[in-house]
């Protein structure tokens, strides 16, 4: 298969509500009409799939119903949002992009975005 460059930010800090967003940009060598995007998490040398979506160029990304990810696409950019994150989910989140159709098939894998998640401190009890 053919290689393709994928760029993503090096570091992202999740919000206090456990939401992290980042852009995954790919250098499309051709005019792909069908694209698959996969987010993988690498931590302690283990790799797990977080979510995956396919989309037709110009349309919304379609994730599975139970996915913790949402996203939108614009040209060769995919705006990804991961929700429900906790401190234990801190790790390197790698964006993988495949140009599925038309041929040839292209595959690009980003260097990863280190997402830091800090669990919010519980609110102190009030005396009021």
């Amino acid at each position: 298969c053919k290689a393709m460059h994928v760029a993503q930010p090096a570091v992202v800090l999740a919000s206090s509500r456990g939401i992290a967003s980042f852009v995954c940009e790919y250098a499309s060598p051709g005019k792909a009409t069908e694209v698959r995007v996969t987010v993988l998490r690498q931590a302690d040398s283990q790799v797990t799939e977080v979510c995956a979506a396919t989309y037709m160029m110009g349309n919304e990304l379609t994730f599975l119903d139970d996915s913790i990810c949402t996203g939108t696409s614009s040209g060769n950019q995919v705006n990804l949002t991961i929700q429900g994150l906790r401190a234990m989910d801190t790790g390197l989140y790698i964006c993988k992009v495949e140009l599925m159709y038309p041929p040839p098939y292209y595959l690009g894998i980003g260097n990863g975005t280190q997402i830091y998640v800090i669990d919010p401190e519980p609110c102190p009890d009030s005396d009021f």
């Epitope: 298969c1 290689a3 996969t38 993988l40 690498q42 790799v47 797990t48 799939e49 995956a52 790698i94 993988k96 595959l107 894998i109």
Partner: nanobody, 119 residues
Framework: EVQLVESGGGLVQAGGSLRLSCAAS????????MGWFRQAPGKEREFVAD????????YYAGSVKGRFTISRDNAKNTVYLQMNSLKPEDTAVYYC????????????WGQGTQVTVSS
Amino acid sequence: EVQLVESGGGLVQAGGSLRLSCAASGGTFSSYGMGWFRQAPGKEREFVADIRSSAGRTYYAGSVKGRFTISRDNAKNTVYLQMNSLKPEDTAVYYCAAEMTGITGWDYWGQGTQVTVSS
């Protein structure tokens, strides 16, 4: 070192069926993502279908959706491609591929098996 060996190709008439097999040796097959690709003479290599190690989720190219089915038998270290309602444009060499982690791409490829669909 992972080795992939395809079988099941051949000559079939349009509308017919074939089942391709890809036997893997070496490594932990159940953790691999497995895929099928094809390449027709003078054309670029084309994605056909794949099956993820996680939950066995499948994905198909639009051109084969509804006609081809990918499946795996982890006990036999084998992935299959059931091809029904074959068309002359399905004629190609079909390659099996394996990805170890998902972050290194398709790490291993078979030698391919020829499928010819006559009209």
